[in-house]
């Protein structure tokens, strides 16, 4: 039950995280105009990964896309790439984890397969979260670097926009959304990996009678099978006696008490 809860919670946390990463990537407020020097401006500038916007006090907002690819700073391109990789990995991870959920039964999928899928999705979520955190952090570092370097008519690291002396940019809402979302995705991934450990098939100690073909007396030893170590290991259980008795692996398996929630 605890395993299912951990897996389910990991999935939900990762889902929220990835939704946040997507939202952050699409948001226009990665950097916002610093109003410290000019708190009474009637024009407010903010910039995203894909376009820059100007909001006039009168309520009109105008946004312009960065219609160049080669003209953009390498750092901005790198941040875009990291965020997109994070989204793609996260989306694949979500897809994999849906099928890996213990509460969802798909055909005769074994627990070992679900454990493998849970681990895979967990790793994907971890990498996705790290990509988002890295992307946001690179952008934040770029902002800090440019903060004191905003000079007239010089291209800076912010989307190639020409900046005049009085306009400086500070952290926008998207950065905080990205950091939190990346963190959630990372936590969700870790939870999936933890859930994977408990998902691996546990060999229950069936007190089943084994019959020897020759009719010789059969040595019976209860509790003789070692439990699997998890993480998808499919180690064959060792026979505890000689002769023609079949191991538990070779006997038709029936659903254990752990198969349903």
């Amino acid at each position: 039950m605890a395993v299912t809860a951990c897996q389910g919670l990991g999935f939900v946390v990762s889902l929220i995280g990835i939704a946040g990463i997507i939202a952050a990537t699409c948001m226009d407020q990665w950097s916002t105009q610093d109003l410290y020097n000019n708190p009474v401006t009637a024009v407010f500038n903010y910039q995203g990964l894909w376009r820059s916007c100007v909001r006039e006090s009168s309520g009109f907002t105008e946004c312009r896309g960065y219609f160049t690819l080669l003209g953009l700073p390498a750092m901005l391109q790198a941040v875009r790439a990291l965020m997109i990789v994070g989204i793609v990995l996260g989306a694949i991870g979500l897809l994999v984890s849906i099928f890996a959920l213990k509460c969802i039964r798909i055909g005769s999928m074994e627990d070992s397969a679900k454990a493998n899928m849970t681990l895979t999705s967990g790793i994907m979520f971890i990498v996705s979260g790290l990509c988002a955190i890295a992307g946001v952090s690179v952008f934040a570092n770029m902002l800090v670097t440019n903060f004191w370097m905003s000079t007239a008519n010089m291209y800076t690291g912010m989307g190639g926009m020409v900046q005049t002396v009085q306009t400086r940019y500070t952290f926008g809402a998207a950065l905080f959304v990205g950091w939190v979302a990346g963190g959630l995705t990372l936590i969700g991934g870790v939870m999936m990996c933890i859930a994977c450990r408990g998902l691996a098939p546990e060999e229950t100690n069936y007190k089943a009678v084994s019959y020897h073909a020759s009719g010789h007396s059969v040595a019976y030893k209860p509790g003789g099978f070692k439990a699997s170590t998890g993480f998808g290991s499919n180690t064959k259980n060792k026979k505890i006696y000689d002769g023609g008795a079949r191991t538990e692996d070779e006997v038709q398996s029936y659903p254990s008490k752990h198969d349903y929630v």
């Epitope: 009474v40 401006t41 009637a42 024009v43 100007v54 006039e56 009109f60 926009m161 009085q166």
Partner: antibody, heavy 117, light 113 residues
Framework: QVQLKESGPGLVAPSQSLSITCTVS????????VSWVRQPPGKGLEWLGV???????NYHSTLISRLRISKDKSKSQVFLKLNSLQTDDTATYYC???????????WGQGTSVTVSS | DIVMTQSPSSLTVTAGEKVTMSCKSS????????????LTWYQQKPGQPPKLLIY???TRESGVPDRFTGSGSGTDFTLTISSVQAEDLAVYYC?????????FGAGTKLELK
């Protein structure tokens, strides 16, 4: 079409308060800002303050302690209240709608206010 | 506060003449985000409220004749009337729309000879 109309007292005694109402039509006060501008007789324009669509206000630094601008969205009215009037507050008071570029694209006809005892 | 200085204070012209008037601001009105100058020109005829002519320093308001042209950037701006008509006789004001308070210039009065 867009229209703005100011209505004021005409004559106000010194040290009293001035209250002017601007009634608008043809646009929503939740979407557009309304500025107040005054013009003393034979002189230039002086921007007083503005109330934006979201209800936030900005005032001229010289009038910030005496001026208050508010609105009643349901009645499509904007109000100007100027306290502690002096004779140099005598002017024609205009309300105007803010448009693109923060420019004032539509103006009322103005209301003349004289501060005199 | 941004101070707007207009010159000359008055202009005497003849019909059909080309006229230019200047407006200077104490601070740059150029916004880096959209590369637009937040300067507005108004025309005020006697006994009438002001009328919007040009915003963003060079964008004509709809219905304004194309003989009116705004130009300039940063701190120096110009309003040009290519061929003055009798109905153009008025006072012309420039306004800072970039930073509060949204200050006006003292105006340039256009008169006929």
């Amino acid at each position: 079409q867009v229209q703005l109309k100011e209505s004021g007292p005409g004559l106000v005694a010194p040290s009293q308060s001035l209250s002017i109402t601007c009634t608008v039509s043809g646009f929503s006060l939740t979407s557009y800002g309304v500025s107040w501008v005054r013009q003393p007789p034979g002189k230039g324009l002086e921007w007083l303050g503005v109330i934006w669509g979201d209800g936030s206000t900005n005032y001229h630094s010289t009038l910030i302690s005496r001026l208050r601008i508010s609105k009643d969205k349901s009645k499509s009215q904007v109000f100007l209240k100027l306290n502690s009037l002096q004779t140099d507050d005598t002017a024609t008071y205009y309300c105007a709608k803010a448009g693109r570029g923060n420019a004032l694209d539509y103006w009322g006809q103005g209301t003349s206010v004289t501060v005199s005892s | 506060d941004i101070v707007m200085t207009q010159s000359p204070s008055s202009l005497t012209v003849t019909a059909g003449e080309k006229v230019t008037m200047s407006c200077k601001s104490s601070q740059s009105l150029l916004n880096s985000g959209n590369q637009k100058n937040y300067l507005t020109w108004y025309q005020q005829k006697p006994g009438q409220p002001p009328k919007l002519l040009i915003y963003w320093a060079s964008t004509r308001e709809s219905g304004v004749p194309d003989r009116f042209t705004g130009s300039g950037s940063g701190t120096d701006f110009t309003l040009t009337i290519s061929s003055v008509q009798a109905e153009d006789l008025a006072v012309y004001y420039c306004q800072n729309d970039y930073s509060f308070p949204l200050t006006f210039g003292a105006g340039t009065k256009l008169e006929l000879k």
